[in-house]
């Protein structure tokens, strides 16, 4: 007999997801309308292309990047799409309620879709730490809590620290990483006997993960420049991100070879490290004045990423129960911090140059922002982890971790799980 969802989840998931979707439809009906202002079509298309780049990054890039498990590749890709679709809907509403609602209705523009896609991307980064250990009903909870936490964090940072869209969205890297790691810490950790093979990577899924990495690599400049205010800022951000990711690819491949006793290249190292430069320059991508600086940051990020991929998985596996190939959590936590530190260093250099106490105050504000992002990520992550442990969600048994057959119908398989 083929494997099935546990009976209760079969009843719980469709009911939970469809009720939620119906609630979202009602909220959209009562509280939103499209931006009806006249725009020229050419401008609209150009604006839409940025949003399209972000959607490609999310659906294909992050979807496939997490698909390297031998027996969990289908679930990785499809669950990512499910979370993206749900996350974007909730993020549009939440951002609207937090920023526009006093005026009566939430106006939906291409920019709000762009923002929402970036918010949903946060969930796709975080979920890498827990994919394979949770079912879709649990992922719905994770999407709702994380998008809500990130939206509120961004609003608080915007209001208290007076930062622009770009600066407060660039906390997404550390936020998503620490959120995911804290959720993983709450979930049952030990992989029981007999499941060791399931969290290993296989050739074809690893190839699709590499495809995901390539999509992310191609579109990372769009991500880092999407929320910047003027053409000069965007152009600079695109250039610097491109130089940084280009160098981090070279560093990743050569560093991976260097880290192996026989000089072999690790797929896992490469998957993660090719993106390192883009994450590291994220916060400061528009501020870096020359290519060589972006390239140096890409080099440093690539080395940190390879070093992290070599030494951290053992620790993450023991403490958090994160499999070796789930590299995004610790990778983004390190590189996101590096990016934030780079921005703070730029402010410190300003202080040294100007000898000005007020710029020193800006340094403190930036440290405060970063600390707040980490604290909210950890707290909301722990809350989510505790919620996901509730019996109501009928989480997969540990023996069925990292297994597509728990969730998918495979007609060609005669024998069940």
């Amino acid at each position: 007999m083929s494997s099935k969802y546990p009976r209760s989840v079969r009843r719980c998931l469709p009911l939970w997801a469809l009720t939620l979707e119906a609630a979202l439809i009602l909220l959209f009906y009562f509280f939103t309308h499209y931006d009806a202002s006249l725009e020229d079509q050419k401008g609209l298309v150009a604006s839409y292309q940025v949003g399209q780049d972000l959607t490609v990054m999310a659906a294909i890039g992050l979807g496939f990047l997490t698909s390297s498990f031998r027996r969990h590749s289908w679930s990785s890709v499809a669950f990512n799409l499910f979370m993206l679709a749900l996350g974007v809907q909730w993020a549009i509403l939440l951002d609207g309620f937090l920023s526009q609602f006093p005026s009566g209705k939430v106006v939906i523009t291409l920019f709000s879709i762009r923002l929402a896609t970036m918010s949903a991307l946060s969930v796709l980064i975080s979920v890498d730490a827990v994919l394979g250990k949770v079912n879709l009903a649990q992922l719905v909870v994770m999407v709702l809590v994380e998008v809500t936490a990130l939206g509120n964090l961004r609003m608080v940072i915007s209001n208290i620290f007076n930062t622009d869209y770009h600066m407060n969205m660039m906390h997404i890297y550390v936020f998503a990483a620490y959120f995911g790691l804290s959720v993983a810490w709450c979930l049952p950790k030990p992989l029981p006997e007999g499941t060791e093979d399931k969290d290993q990577t296989a050739t074809i899924p690893s190839l699709s993960a590499m495809l995901g990495a390539l999509f992310l690599w191609m579109f990372w400049p769009s991500f880092n420049s999407a929320l910047l205010r003027s053409p000069i800022e965007r152009k600079n951000a695109v250039f610097n991100t491109y130089y940084a990711v280009a160098v981090s690819v070279v560093t990743a491949i050569s560093g991976s070879s260097l880290a192996h006793p026989q000089g072999k290249i690790s797929k896992t190292y490469v998957h993660s490290a090719v993106l390192a430069g883009g994450v590291a320059v994220g916060t400061s991508c528009h501020l870096i004045p020359s290519p060589w600086l972006a390239m140096v940051l890409g080099l440093v990020a690539g080395l940190i990423s390879v070093g992290g991929a070599k030494y951290l998985p053992g620790c993450c596996n023991r403490v958090l129960g994160i499999p070796h190939s789930s590299i995004m959590g610790y990778n983004f936590s390190l590189l996101g911090l590096l990016g934030e530190i780079i921005y703070i260093v730029l402010l410190v250099l300003d202080t040294v140059g100007a000898g000005n106490g007020m710029i020193g105050f800006q340094v403190l504000l930036s440290i405060g922002e970063l600390s707040l992002a980490i604290v909210i990520a950890l707290m909301s992550g722990l809350l989510t982890g505790l919620l996901l442990n509730l019996k109501i969600w009928k989480a997969p048994h540990e023996a069925k971790y990292f297994d597509d057959q728990v969730f998918w119908k495979f007609p060609h398989l005669a024998v069940g799980f």
Epitope: D35, E39, D40, G43, L44, A46, S47, V50, T109, L110, F111, R114, S158, N162, T163, D164, Y165, R229, S230, P231, I232, E233, N236, S284, H286, L287, I288, P289, S290, L293, L346, L349, D350, G353, M358, F361, Q362, L365
Partner: antibody, heavy 129, light 108 residues
Framework: QVQLVESGGGVVQPGRSLRLSCAAS????????MHWVRQAPGKGLEWVAG????????YYADSVKGRFTISRDNSRNTMYLQMNSLRAEDTAVYYC??????????????????????WGQGTTVTVSS | EIVLTQSPGSLSLSPGERATLSCRAS???????LAWYQQKPGQAPRLLIY???SRATGIPDRFSGSGSGTDFTLTISRLEPEDFAVYYC?????????FGQGTKVEIR
């Protein structure tokens, strides 16, 4: 020459609507953010709304949020302000202004600056019953 | 939301004198987003100083700006007859253009 020309002002009753236009010439309109600023009789300048160079993002002052809509048509080199549910306190001279962006650099970072470097002569909106 | 407070509200000076106008922000702001404008009766405002010490095109060197954090200053070293006008400071962060309430410089 480089200029901004506002039009569409006039006398209107409270609760009614009005649409202002700002025609730009002499520069690449699609490369600049644009703004509406108003000045009530005998009062100071008040920023009303702004729109990014590509039209993707719009900002409003709290006093007009939900009533006014800023938009632009880069193919026509024109910016608009649709004003609905007008109130007596919306009576003012409305200026359109171009957002100039630039930067200076040190060896390690860029410093961006933004200001309104080009203004129209203004169009008067009077809301009165 | 950032609030800009200009002082004094008005200033009575004679031509040739030095004018010092102050602008205080309710919280620390990036100095590169601060600008000063001059407005004469019946005319549109004109950009004077930005970022906070660069002069706009065509602005004479008797106008200078300084400051950082929360305190900014516009200085007119020697007032000329055409300088008597209302001066506004503006913060232009986050694409929102907050103005101060203005300082009127009038002939004594």
């Amino acid at each position: 020459q480089v200029q901004l020309v506002e039009s569409g002002g006039g006398v209107v009753q409270p609760g009614r609507s009005l649409r202002l236009s700002c025609a730009a010439s002499g520069f690449t309109f699609s490369s600049y953010g644009m703004h509406w600023v108003r000045q009530a009789p005998g009062k100071g300048l008040e920023w009303v709304a702004g729109i990014w160079y590509d039209g993707s993002n719009k900002y409003y002052a709290d006093s007009v949020k939900g009533r006014f809509t800023i938009s632009r048509d880069n193919s026509r080199n024109t910016m608009y302000l649709q004003m609905n549910s007008l109130r007596a306190e919306d009576t003012a001279v409305y200026y359109c202004a171009r957002e100039q962006g630039g930067y200076s650099s040190s060896w390690y970072r860029r410093y961006y600056y933004y200001n309104m470097d080009l203004w129209g002569q203004g169009t008067t909106v009077t809301v009165s019953s | 939301e950032i609030v800009l407070t200009q002082s004094p509200g008005s200033l009575s000076l004679s031509p040739g004198e030095r004018a010092t106008l102050s602008c205080r922000a309710s919280q620390s702001v990036s100095s590169s987003y601060l600008a000063w404008y001059q407005q004469k009766p019946g005319q549109a405002p004109r950009l004077l100083i930005y970022g906070p010490s660069s002069r706009a095109t065509g602005i004479p060197d008797r106008f200078s700006g300084s400051g950082s954090g929360t305190d900014f200053t516009l200085t007119i070293s020697r007032l000329e007859p055409e300088d008597f006008a209302v001066y506004y400071c503006q913060h232009f962060g986050n694409s929102r253009g907050t103005f101060g309430q203005g300082t009127k410089v009038e002939i004594r």
